[in-house]
């Protein structure tokens, strides 16, 4: 046979050849980085002549093109500077917002060298809508305008770029948006690992810590019922093993498998973990159903035991197979366990499908992914209970619109990536999990489901009690802080009598802690105000207590999220460079924000806190309650910026026997302290002796009823004092360095 | 600190047997790959063996195959050596040495034990 | 005869830089690990995984490794580094793969 001729070369870059020059042999380009090859590959054909895929006419010169990232098709509410059709590596985009609109995400963003932007969307917001804008990433056109229940946006991206991420999404009862925002990438664009890592590692570890890490294993119990206790993890690990992965990349592979399984045994979780290796047919290494899933070294065994040449007869790449073999694998675990009991329907399923192109037989993977999702009954509701990683390897042939069809759409996630080679993937695997480090007290899981207790909901609700009578209610923010309000303290009583009980009291969980000392803000004085006719002033209104010992963790006691905190920072799935003002922005990010605070009697209830305009309107009605503020003639002397406010509508109000406990907000699943209890016009509680019992106020009193609570944003400086040790906290504001 | 101890080298007539042992500390050794390196005097480093971290692959250099034997026992962190048929040309300094879970992606060298085979 | 190519020897001045490669076959799609000899010790790694070095190793010594040809780089070579290197990767089906080494003299 002819071979084809050798006048190939890429001025500025390099080749490599599969199988020499001969018939069949790929040619595939490479250029320094910043740079991408035109074409990127060629084919020997058996007349002799090269083939360029997707050319139109007979070969051109190979030459390395400066690589661009994609120019913002409209901004809204706002302008960006400077304004180029697209921009150079290095080069810098700035965004600003109108009067009246608040900037979330990135003000300045720069290009980076594989043609994606560094940071995030950024997006001009006044708060008004139930969802927050969406915003339009970079190089996208969206169509929808209304924020509201039930509306839809939908996105598409212009010229040649290609759309990764959700094309329409639809704005929840829950105040998020559905799917996971879109992106347009340049086609030759891939990931660098340093970004994959951390996206993909803070994924698994919300699913880690939805999945109650820290419930050691005991192994006397029953399988079943350790399930149902705290829920487990199905981990399926797709190797692609068709004729274009060389032995090489499967090596490597394996070697990354083996990486991920060690790291996801290292949890304190219930995991089974099935082995696929797939190429025209698959090959099941290790299946869910098998006991052996469950032990590590039996998974690395089978993982090692893999071998390349197991599918040297069938060379294609049918990832429909691979993909049905799970559902398979499903099918069979749900006629096992039983369709309906808890065991099946607590169990969360991650798949993992390493691969390095496009499915070329078999039929669309996306069947077999839609039948994954009917038999898990994933919905709004159960969205949690299956995340899907579709993992690109090589820039070549790997397409991008599968792997997006592929992957989980979720909010503030990525589930779909391209990487350059299998080294960077395992580059990925290495450090996904880092994160592991912080599982051991991971912050902000409670349990959700209908069978939960109280404590089990808000494993961080704490009581604190003097000798006698139970006065307040606090959050655990790590395992041996606890975070309250100043009052409960101002009668100056010897805390050393005092108690901490933590986990339910009710139960054999409940555990009274000692006080090792107590951390009450100076600048608490609740008659700091008396000659202005402020009869108490609750300013500065915050505690802390160290405990005599660290609490253990269980599934009845553990810390909530304090916003502006690393912990909190890979809980809300954030880019790493985020800061505290991301996170308020987020978190209370519209005008009447739905949150909760927890009763005398443990149950949760729900408040809105009043944001912008509606804060002013809801401390207004301050200036009516004459009792306490007799001569108040600014509502801002009683209310001052630190007090988040509720109690309008049909909120709940907080009971004197509340005050210290966490105003928290829900987001991804994970809770959130943005607040704590302090004071309030109305005690629903007065006279009864009934926990369970609150009365609701009167309509036509006056004033009506209004809570205020400490805002935790208002209070960093205190807090990164005393707990700067504790925890790991993230810098107030972005520093731009602007480029000229 | 991560340390491998090798023992068991000596002086053995041709076609004798002898039995290396490395010992492991300091890692979680049922974790991973595990290799034996030979360095024949004044020459340079020759892979002999290697064993997966559970024991059930093993490979072999041509130049052993079917007389050298490797295993490990995890419970006692501990990798062998069965020599057998031994000969003049296997006389060198063992090296056992730590890869990585799969890959024979060296990290962690021991100190090395010398057989001698003559008559 | 190994499948990995080494110089047999490289000399450089103190102070200089000095480069050791080690070819074969696509070894840009392996990993790479570089290991320091000196008389009478076992080998120590200088480099693993292409570009990590251990802890202890000096920063001086840096590895990289493309399309064929893996290199191990020693900027302002001192004395102390006189000593042969090898480069290491995996083969087919399993087995492993060593240099032939280099012996780096650092001139006096």
């Known amino acids: 046979a002819p071979s084809c001729p050798q006048n190939v070369n890429i001025s500025g870059g390099t080749f490599t050849l599969s199988h020499g020059w001969a018939p069949g042999s790929l040619l595939t380009y490479s250029c320094p980085q910043g740079l991408y090859p035109s074409p990127a590959s060629r084919l020997c054909k058996s007349s002799g002549q090269w083939q360029t895929p997707g050319a139109t006419r007979s070969l051109s010169k190979a030459v390395c093109k400066p690589v661009r990232c994609p120019a913002p098709v409209s901004f809204e509410n706002g302008i960006y500077t400077p304004r180029l059709g697209s921009y150079p590596v290095g080069g810098n985009v700035s965004f600003e917002c109108e009067d009246g609109f608040i900037l979330r995400g990135s003000p300045v963003r720069q290009c980076r060298p594989n043609g994606m932007w560094d940071g995030e969307t950024a997006v001009c917001d006044n708060g008004a809508g139930h969802c927050p804008n969406p915003g339009i990433s970079l190089g996208a056109v969206r169509t929808g305008f209304r924020f509201g229940h039930g509306d839809k946006v939908r996105y598409r991206c212009s010229s040649n770029l290609v759309l990764t991420g959700s094309s329409e999404r639809e704005c929840q009862g829950n105040g998020v948006w559905s799917g996971t925002e879109p992106i347009c990438r340049q086609p030759y664009s891939y990931d660098f690992p340093e970004d994959v890592a951390p996206a993909l590692g803070t994924s698994f570890s919300h699913m880690l810590g939805a999945t109650n890490p820290t419930q050691k294993t005991k192994e006397s119990l029953g399988r079943k019922i350790q399930i149902q206790r705290s829920g487990h993890l199905n981990l399926y690990l797709l190797l692609d093993c068709s004729q274009s992965v060389s032995e090489n990349d499967f090596l490597i592979f394996k070697e990354s498998a083996s990486l991920m399984v060690d790291r996801i045994f290292s949890f304190e979780i219930n995991v089974s973990v099935a082995i696929i290796t797939f190429a025209s047919e698959p090959k099941v290494l290790m299946s869910v159903l098998n006991d052996n899933s469950r032990d590590m070294t039996e998974v690395i065994s089978s993982l090692e035991n893999a071998n390349y040449k197991d599918h040297e007869n069938g060379t294609g790449t049918n990832t429909y197979a691979a993909l049905n073999s799970v559902y398979l694998m499903m099918n069979n675990q749900m006629r096992l366990l039983g369709m309906e009991t808890m065991a099946w329907q607590e169990i969360r399923h991650a798949i993992i499908l390493l691969t390095d192109g496009k499915s070329n037989m078999g039929g669309s993977p996306k069947t077999a992914v839609d039948h994954i999702r009917e038999i898990l009954n994933i919905n709004q509701k159960r969205n949690d209970y299956l995340d899907i990683y579709a993992i690109g390897v090589g820039k070549l042939d790997v397409d991008w619109r599968e792997l997006n069809e592929l992957g989980s759409k979720k909010d503030g996630e990525r589930h779909a990536f391209i990487l350059q080679d299998t080294k960077a993937l395992h580059q990925v695997f290495e450090h996904m999990l880092d994160v592991s480090k912080l599982t051991d007290t991971i912050c902000g899981v409670g349990n959700m489901s209908a069978n939960a207790s109280d404590q089990e909901r808000t494993p961080w609700h704490v009581t604190i009690k003097p000798k006698s009578q139970e006065t307040c209610r606090g959050a655990l923010i790590s395992d041996q802080w606890v975070l309250t309000a100043a009052h409960c303290f101002r009668d100056g009583n010897d805390h050393s009598l005092w108690r901490v009980n933590v986990g339910d009291p009710k139960s054999q969980w409940g555990k009274e802690f000692l006080i090792e000392k107590a951390v009450i803000s100076p600048g608490f004085d609740v008659f700091a105000k008396k000659n202005q006719g402020i009869l108490e002033f609750y300013g500065d209104d915050i505690a802390l207590l160290k405990l005599a010992q660290k609490v253990k963790m269980s599934t009845h006691a553990r810390p909530i999220c304090l916003p502006c905190t690393m912990e909190a920072n890979l809980a809300l799935r954030r880019p790493q460079g985020s800061t505290c003002r991301d996170h308020e922005n987020e978190l209370l990010n519209k005008q009447s924000v739905p949150a909760h605070f927890v009763a005398l009697n443990g149950s949760k209830l729900n408040i809105n806190l009043k944001m912008g305009v509606e804060w002013t309107s809801c401390a207004e009605v301050v200036s009516q309650e004459k009792t306490m503020f007799p001569n108040l003639t600014d509502v801002r002397e009683v209310v001052t910026d630190q007090f988040l406010c509720s109690g309008t509508q049909e909120d709940e109000s907080p009971c004197k026997g509340e005050s210290g406990g966490a105003v928290f907000l829900e987001r991804r699943f994970r809770f959130f302290q943005v607040g704590l209890v302090s004071w309030g016009l109305y005690n629903p509680c007065l006279g009864s002796a009934d926990k369970n019992s609150r009365k609701r106020a009167p309509r036509s009193k006056v004033p009506p009823p209004r809570d205020f609570h400490i805002n935790l944003f208002r209070m960093q400086p205190w807090l990164r004092q005393h707990l700067g040790d504790v925890l790991n906290f993230l810098p107030l504001h972005h520093h731009h360095h602007h480029h000229h | 600190e991560v340390q491998l101890l090798e023992s068991g080298g000596g002086l053995v007539q041709p076609g004798g047997s002898l039995r290396l042992s490395c010992a492991a500390s300091?890692?979680?050794?049922?974790?991973?790959?595990m290799m034996w390196v030979r360095q024949a005097p004044g020459k340079g480093l020759e892979w002999v063996s290697s064993?997966?971290?559970?024991?059930?692959?093993?490979n072999y250099a041509d130049s052993v195959k079917g007389r050298f034997t490797i295993s490990r026992d995890n419970s006692k962190n501990t990798l062998y050596l069965q020599m057998n048929s031994l000969r003049a040309e296997d006389t060198a300094t063992y090296y056992c040495?730590?890869?990585?879970?799969?890959?024979?992606?060296?990290?962690?060298w021991g100190q090395g034990t010398l057989v001698t085979v003559s008559s | 005869q190994s499948a990995l190519t080494q110089p047999p020897s490289v000399s450089v001045s103190p102070g200089q830089t000095a480069t050791i490669t080690c070819s074969g076959d696509k070894l840009g799609e392996k990993y790479v690990s570089w290991y320091q000899q000196k008389p009478g010790q076992s080998p120590v790694v200088v480099i693993f995984?292409?570009?990590k070095r251990p802890s202890g190793i000096p920063e001086r010594f840096s590895g990289s490794n493309s399309g064929n040809t893996a290199t191990l780089t020693i900027s302002g070579t001192q004395a102390m580094d006189e000593a042969d290197y090898y480069c290491?990767?995996?083969?087919?089906?399993?087995?492993?793969?060593f240099g032939g080494g280099t012996k780096l003299t650092v001139l006096r």
């Open positions: 064993i997966g971290s559970s024991g059930g692959t093993t």
């Open positions: 995984q292409d570009i």
């Open positions: 300091g890692f979680t050794f049922s974790r991973y790959y």
């Open positions: 040495a730590k890869g990585g879970m799969v890959l024979g992606v060296v990290n962690i």
């Open positions: 290491q990767t995996w083969g087919t089906g399993g087995i492993q793969v």
